[in-house]
Amino acid sequence: LIIGFGISGRHSITVTTVASAGNIGEDGILSCTFEPDIKLSDIVIQWLKEGVLGLVHEFKEGKDELSEQDEMFRGRTAVFADQVIVGNASLRLKNVQLTDAGTYKCYIITSKGKGNANLEYKTGAFSMPEVNVDYNASSETLRCEAPRWFPQPTVVWASQVDQGANFSEVSNTSFELNSENVTMKVVSVLYNVTINNTYSCMIENDIAKATGDIKVTESEIKRRSHLQLLNSKAS
């Protein structure tokens, strides 16, 4: 969490941003909130990016003002116009690119004063893993697959019954480059598994951590998966 204050003494407002991550090829959100104003026409929102000459986005007098927008963001940005009046200056970024990573500044002007806060935005690829029983293998085997990751993640298997066990000797992980030549498909196979035990396939890079769980019993297969973004710090 980054909380910034205006520099002009008593004419400062609090602006808050949250460090976040974008999944390349998908839409992302750069979060920013501020002390709201009564009149929309008195609010100016400017998004800037370190190292970029033009603006990322500008919103003033109740509408977008994109005449000074940098070429790399053309047609890809939007604020939540109906939420600006309640203090939401978050930016929606369409079709996130690797090059969108960096330090952004959310700069706000209202009738109460000015304020800004920086935001670290990471970009990469992350996806939910799916763990399935591999019927083609000669022994009891599980297969964990996740379609899109970047940078290359680590894959670790764990089990509820054998907590703390190292499964690296009985697992095999491969990374296959996807057609766009950036992201990779992750496939990990775990051998010699037993029933009535929950196995977890954990995939992690510096952007996200995802886990797929599976439990095989005589009567059913239970699956669960979840994904969490790392380093979501507010400023």
């Epitope: 029983v133 019927y135 029933i195 009567s219 297969i221």
Partner: nanobody, 122 residues
Framework: EVQLVESGGGLVQPGGSLRLSCAAS????????MHWVRQVPGKGREWVSR????????SYEDSVKGRFTISRDNAKNTVYLQMHGLRAEDTAVYYC???????????????WGQGTLVTVSS
């Protein structure tokens, strides 16, 4: 309550054929892989074959490959084992059982019918 009822066994000469049936009830048949397991009197149980819930995937123990065919009729909640080219070493009590996956360690199976005896002898 899970019920599995095997039938179709009998005495057959070497090289002969038999078709075993297993009628299942008490569970959602289409959720389960079905397996055939056999037990030679006085010996342990041995896995023979398996079939996936939709019938698209089958697998066999090496000694019966090319001679036995597993199939299922999901409308009738029944699994079959067609046996050709029977040999004396195929003599056993044949059981069908169910499991959530295609895994087939004998100790995983919990539900058993009464079995049907196949005797291959001249």
């Amino acid at each position: 309550e899970v019920q599995l009822v095997e039938s179709g066994g009998g005495l057959v000469q070497p090289g002969g054929s038999l078709r075993l049936s297993c009628a299942a009830s008490g569970f959602t048949f289409t959720d389960f892989w079905m397996h055939w397991v056999r037990q030679v009197p006085g010996k342990g149980r041995e896995w023979v074959s398996r079939i996936s819930p939709d019938g698209s995937s089958t697998s066999y123990e090496d000694s019966v490959k090319g001679r036995f065919t597993i199939s299922r009729d999901n409308a009738k909640n029944t699994v079959y084992l067609q046996m050709h080219g029977l040999r004396a070493e195929d003599t056993a009590v044949y059981y069908c059982t169910r499991f959530s996956t295609g895994w087939h360690r004998i100790e995983y199976f919990q539900h058993w019918g009464q079995g049907t005896l196949v005797t291959v002898s001249s």
